[in-house]
């Protein structure tokens, strides 16, 4: 059992062609965050937010991924292929690694609402 807790936006849905914010929040620990990694369902890295070096968006996603808000990530121009799991990995000292999971469903329907509630995975 780790000291801290990762809260995430949980299961969210958004419209095809729209955008969505992926958010994780680390609480209940005094550990310092040195880096947050954002990964896609196939474990490919989307982006990194390093405490010293700032943001790095991986080339394959530069056109559709925007850093922030905060340590979160904004996905734009959503396609149906974006449906799936996303992971935030917090690298901290001295606690080690915390990992949060978000499931994004991209909907064709124009009535799809972007839901965003924080939950503990």
């Amino acid at each position: 059992m780790m000291t801290g807790t990762i809260e995430t936006t949980g299961n969210i849905s958004a419209k095809k062609g729209g955008s969505v914010i992926l958010q994780c929040h680390l609480s209940s620990t005094m550990a310092q965050v040195t880096q947050v990694n954002w990964e896609q369902h196939d474990h490919s890295l989307l982006a990194i937010r390093n405490a010293e070096l700032g943001w790095h968006i991986y080339p394959a996603f530069k056109d559709r991924v925007a850093p922030g808000p905060g340590l979160g990530l904004t996905l734009q121009s959503l396609t149906m292929n974006d449906t799936g799991e996303y992971f935030c990995t917090y690298h901290t000292y001295p606690d080690g690694t915390y990992r949060g999971r978000i499931f994004l469903e991209v909907l064709e329907s124009s009535v799809a609402e972007h839901s965003a509630r924080f939950q503990i995975p």
Partner: antibody
Framework: QLQLQESGPGLVKPAETLSLTCTVS??????????WTWIRQPPGKCLEWIGT???????FHNPSLKSRVTIPVDTSKNQFSLKLSSVTAADTAVYYC??????????????WGQGTLVTVSS | DIQMTQSPSSLSASVGDRVTITCRAS??????LNWYQQKPGKAPKLLIY???SLQSGVPSRFSGSGSGTDFTLTISSLQPEDFATYYC?????????FGCGTKVEIK
């Protein structure tokens, strides 16, 4: 197999700066999953944590050493260093570098260098 | 800072003996307690992490237990190569701190 090797002068004069380098082989210092540490052991005494660094330069150090400690990282050489300023005889110790790992909660020091003795004397 | 106190500071034992070393933290550290073995002129070697997890390659005669403030390292049947100094270390919070060691000597 990961290996760490400390190097640097074995004798430092009082009030000068102690400089040591740890060269990592068999693994990358730029690994996102690991932190890198300096620990020392004065002759016949307890182990003391000096500080820890991440590949990007984020540093955590022991407040007991105040602002005397810096831990630079050179990812191009797969090395991290220790610089301890204004040394006194009390800084005489065997200095170890170590890796923080494996990927578990609140990880321990799983790989260590063999250590290098640094004597502070005029 | 979290103080780590080991006892005894030294002990004498024979090959085949069951040996128990204790470590007490000055405040609760959950299960974030690690044990190391150090032989003269050598670097410490990780034996047990997270209070009770055996590091890869370490013989099963070594075991750890405890949580909160009180922890134990046990060697079920002491072997000739086990004569060394053993240190506990907390990785709960910075500054990281070590116990001052228990020296296991030949009786």
């Amino acid at each position: 197999q990961l290996q760490l090797q400390e190097s640097g002068p074995g004798l430092v004069k009082p009030a000068e700066t102690l400089s040591l380098t740890c060269t990592v082989s068999g693994g990358s210092i730029s690994s996102y999953d690991h932190y890198w540490t300096w620990i020392r052991q004065p002759p016949g005494k307890c182990l003391e944590w000096i500080g820890t660094v991440y590949y990007s330069g984020s540093t955590f150090h022991n407040p007991s050493l105040k602002s005397r400690v810096t831990i630079p990282v050179d990812t191009s050489k797969n090395q991290f260093s220790l610089k301890l300023s204004s040394v006194t005889a009390a800084d005489t110790a065997v200095y170890y570098c170590a890796r923080v790992g494996p990927d578990v909660s609140h990880p321990p020091f799983d790989y260590w260098g063999q250590g290098t003795l640094v004597t502070v004397s005029s | 800072d979290i103080q780590m106190t080991q006892s005894p500071s030294s002990l004498s034992a024979s090959v085949g003996d069951r040996v128990t070393i204790t470590c007490r933290a000055s405040q609760s550290i959950s299960s974030y307690l690690n044990w190391y073995q150090q032989k003269p002129g050598k670097a410490p070697k990780l034996l047990i992490y997270a209070a009770s997890s055996l590091q890869s390659g370490v013989p099963s005669r070594f075991s750890g237990s405890g949580s909160g403030t009180d922890f134990t390292l046990t060697i079920s049947s002491l072997q000739p190569e086990d004569f060394a100094t053993y240190y506990c270390q907390q990785s709960y919070s910075t500054p990281i701190t070590f116990g001052c060691g228990t020296k296991v000597e030949i009786k």
